[in-house]
Structures are given as structure tokens and as C-alpha cells.
């Protein structure tokens, strides 16, 4: 549901973020220190443009642990 060129909006976006980020939580605006470009916010990026898994993961609150 979040391949290249897909858009995610509304509750579908919220639910997808909850799934991707799991218990890490998420931000709707990426903290500036973690943004490698001017962050538009995830609604802007995923709903008005398109997003993929990699982009979604940048909005998770803490980095995923590498096992």
C-alpha cells in the first residue's frame, strides 16, 4: 500500500505510520536536526505528492534498532 508513486492521506496515513513505526511513535513534522532537506511534513509529502516506505520511516520518533 506504500510503493513508489502511492499517496496516503487521512486515517490511512495515520494507520500506516502507526504500523511502520510500531512502538517507536512518529512525528508529523520531522525534527529539523533529522531532516536532510526542508521538511514539508508527512501529510504534505505523502498525501499531496507521493511517498514510500523509506520516507515514512524518516518520520518515526526513534531509529529502528538493528538486531
Amino acid at each position: 500500500a506504500y510503493g513508489p508513486g502511492e499517496t496516503l492521506c487521512g486515517g490511512e496515513l495515520v494507520d500506516t505510520l502507526q504500523f511502520v513505526c510500531s512502538d517507536r511513535g512518529f512525528y508529523f513534522s520531522r525534527p529539523s536536526s533529522r531532516a536532510n532537506r526542508r521538511s514539508r511534513g508527512i501529510v504534505e509529502e505523502c498525501c499531496f505528492r507521493s511517498c514510500d516506505l523509506a520516507l515514512l520511516e524518516t518520520y518515526c520518533a526513534t531509529p529502528a534498532k538493528s538486531e
Partner: antibody, heavy 120, light 107 residues
């Protein structure tokens, strides 16, 4: 208090365009997305599209794609909805409505509505 | 597009009655369902969002429930000011869509 005030009623001929304004006050204009919804006489509600007042990005319902344009003026905290190539079935009350949060929780503040009548 | 089907389209009830309105989505929308009240000549007012979250200032006689595809708006004891039309709306995905409305009339 938080308020959305829309422009007055319009009467247009088929084929013409109409531009409805919606002026926001009482909150930070650029912090909330704005929807446009219309209601034909005696009918239900129909979502037309949304604009991000901060960056100006838009998303339109497919039905209106190519005929609707939503814009904003941050200096006056106003959003606009222009509908072109009007037909008689575009006769409706047009509402702007503020999004609650993240496009996920509905519309909590509505304008008073603008009646657009399309008649030859 | 997600279709929203409301029932009944109209109902007659008396002051004090318990009223139930249902809304069904054509696919799962989780809990992203909102309810609005509209009185003649007025804009809609948001009553409930996220299926069951009552908006500030809305009387506690209103309640919402459901998730997935089936949702309910209940008015526990109908008051004179509650005679209006009620709409459900999904905010799960674009385009956002509304139910056809339920008109609550005086019996």
C-alpha cells in the same frame, strides 16, 4: 473567536466561472488545511477538494479535476475556490471548512456558505 | 472511492425517544468516521470524530460507536433542538465522502 466568513451569493450563466472566497480569523491560518464542500438544493454533502494554506498544495476530487482551482492569500488569511465551465447542476451552497488535524478527524469550523446559482 | 451508506434516510421520533442512525462504509475505514448535524439554512456542525470522540460543547446524550465498516450515532433522549439532518463522513482516504444523510423529524 475562530471564524470563516465567505463571500456573498452569486448568479452565473452556464459556461461562466465563479470564484468564492473564505476569510479565516481567530487562529493561525497556515496551520490548518482547508476543505471545500458543496451541497445542492435538498441534497447531501459533496467533498470537492482541499488546500494547504501554508504551501498552497491542493488535492481535488476527480469529479472536479480540470474545473476547480483552489488558491490562498496568506497576507489576508483567505482561501479561494474557483469553479469554471459552470453547468446548471453546479447550483449549490459552497462551504469552506477547516480540517481538525492531519486530514483524519473531520472538519470542525465551517463558513456560512455561499449560494451559487447557475441559470440561463 | 469509499461509499458511505446511511440508514434510515429519515425517521420520525418524539422528544425523549432514543434514536439510532447507522452508517456503513464500502470498505474498512478503521475508526476514521465523523458525524455532523445540520439544521435548515445552516452549515453542518461537527458532533463526533474518530467514531466516538464527542466534540467540545456537544451534549452527552450524543454518542458514537463502531469501527471497520459499521458505525452508529445514538441520541439517548431526543430534545427539541435535535431535530435536524445528520451526516456521516469518512476521513480514511481521499476523496473524503459523506453518507446521504438522515433527517430526524418530529412525530
Amino acid at each position: 473567536q475562530v471564524q470563516l466568513v465567505q463571500s456573498g451569493a452569486e448568479v452565473k450563466k452556464p459556461g461562466a466561472s465563479v470564484k468564492v472566497s473564505c476569510k479565516a480569523s481567530g487562529y493561525t491560518f497556515t496551520s490548518y488545511y482547508m476543505h471545500w464542500v458543496r451541497q445542492a438544493p435538498g441534497q447531501g454533502l459533496e467533498w470537492m477538494g482541499i488546500i494547504n494554506p501554508s504551501g498552497g498544495s491542493t488535492s481535488y476530487a476527480q469529479k472536479f479535476q480540470g474545473r476547480v482551482t483552489m488558491t490562498r492569500d496568506t497576507s489576508t488569511s483567505t482561501v479561494y475556490m474557483e469553479l469554471s465551465r459552470l453547468r446548471s447542476d453546479d447550483t449549490a451552497v459552497y462551504y469552506c471548512a477547516r480540517d481538525v488535524q492531519w486530514l483524519a478527524y473531520g472538519m470542525d469550523v465551517w463558513g456560512q456558505g455561499t449560494t451559487v446559482t447557475v441559470s440561463s | 472511492d469509499i461509499q458511505m451508506t446511511q440508514s434510515p434516510s429519515s425517521l420520525s421520533a418524539s422528544v425523549g425517544d432514543r434514536v439510532t442512525i447507522t452508517c456503513r462504509a464500502s470498505q474498512s475505514i478503521s475508526s476514521y468516521l465523523n458525524w455532523y448535524q445540520q439544521k435548515p439554512g445552516r452549515a453542518p456542525d461537527l458532533l463526533i470524530n474518530a467514531a466516538s470522540s464527542l466534540q467540545s460543547g456537544v451534549p452527552s446524550r450524543f454518542s458514537g460507536s463502531g469501527s471497520g465498516t459499521d458505525f452508529t450515532l445514538t441520541i439517548s433522549s431526543l430534545q427539541p433542538e435535535d431535530f435536524a439532518t445528520y451526516f456521516c463522513q469518512q476521513s480514511y482516504s481521499l476523496p473524503f465522502t459523506f453518507g446521504g444523510g438522515t433527517k430526524v423529524e418530529i412525530k
